[in-house]
Amino acid sequence: DVQYPPKKVTTVIQNPMPIREGDTVTLSCNYNSSNPSVTRYEWKPHGAWEEPSLGVLKIQNVGWDNTTIACAACNSWCSWASPVALNVQYAPRDVRVRKIKPLSEIHSGNSVSLQCDFSSSHPKEVQFFWEKNGRLLGKESQLNFDSISPEDAGSYSCWVNNSIGQTASKAWTLEVLYAPRRLRVSMSPGDQVMEGKSATLTCESDANPPVSHYTWFDWNNQSLPYHSQKLRLEPVKVQHSGAYWCQGTNSVGKGRSPLSTLTVYYSPETIGRR
């Protein structure tokens, strides 16, 4: 009675192909003949699953990275089968938005390029989708802005699709820095004020980051010794009549308002004295 190890051992995948991430995969360990009889089976990678009793291995919720598996049929000796590739298919992984240009801060007017990156996908054929606030923006791997504006700021996501599924990036916040714009001088209580009362001029603007420094100018383009957002004239004099404008500065640059005219008229008392 000649004893010999198990012959022609093969690992057979029982599932229909393709196998998808999350599937339950059943493999059997087959052999042609053995003397003495096969008493146990081994599987590689070792210890990844509970020791299967018969020559059948069930992998619950198969991972995307389960690549190859081999079995051995053992009597007094173990004979190993060639490894089989599970070839698990999975949706794109590790999707993220990456800013290609510029490297650091984004300024209004810049040409900006965002890249939708992913680490791997099986199958490799993918589609891209960009969205902002639920609105589809593009279907390329890159999202390009020729001249970005403050209105383009917001939360962006990209999606990568393959035949198995789709994966979204984390929301990516695009912040646009811009010099003060839309500056205007507002006047309170109005642009016509009686002498002796108070007039407040406010420099209103839109800026990111906010304006850090204001400069006020009169009709002669003479800078006034005031550097806050509000210019308070109290008591206001007839000589204060004229056009005023303001300049706002932030870390990006400067902006200036158009001229606004303040008219200060004489009080009845002054008129009566004349």
Epitope: P102, L103, S104, H107, G109, S212, H213, T249, S251, G253
Partner: antibody, heavy 115, light 107 residues
Amino acid sequence: AVQLQQSGVELVRPGASVKLSCTGSDFNIKEDYIHWVKQRPEQGLEWIGWIDPENGDTEYASKFQGKATITADTSSNTAYLQLSSLTSEDTAVYYCATYGSLDYWGQGTTLTVSS
Amino acid sequence: DIKMTQSPSSMYAFLGERVTITCKASQGINSFLTWFQQKPGKSPKTLIYRANRLVDGVPSRFSGSGSGQDYSLTISSLEYEDVGIYYCLQYDEFPRTFGGGTKLEIK
């Protein structure tokens, strides 16, 4: 990729003026400010000033007021730095840079002021 | 003008060592601070902006922190290619101002 190409080495006499150039490729210089930075031999970096090529607005560090004049020609996508009344103190490498917080830099122009 | 005081002006460190460089502004700069690396004969290269945001492609061993007036650049484990001069730049106000630089060399 954004690139800034600067003019070559300059050797000039004291008291003279010089105009250095910085040409953008793969981007329009109107997209952001062009900054100029000075680096004297074995020394640190000094910000000279910037220009907004879109409208010609400029801003200078007080130290360089009267010494430096920054201009731009959008038709050739080029910014310039003119330095006047040169002395040995102006011997340095001059860089142009653009975008964000100075993301992209030219290779630098070496200016030597010597008689 | 905002003055940026950088320290140390030069330092030696062992490969694998943790290295920290600091920059102190003469007034608050709202985290508008960039760190550059410059190698001999080369232009500066941006590593970190807005005090703590790593530029894409810069190794993750570089990190930045700080707020208000005090900022720092840390290299978690020094590598040979990290030798060079490091500069901080404040871009909160005009004129832009640089720190004096820190020359980093291997022991």
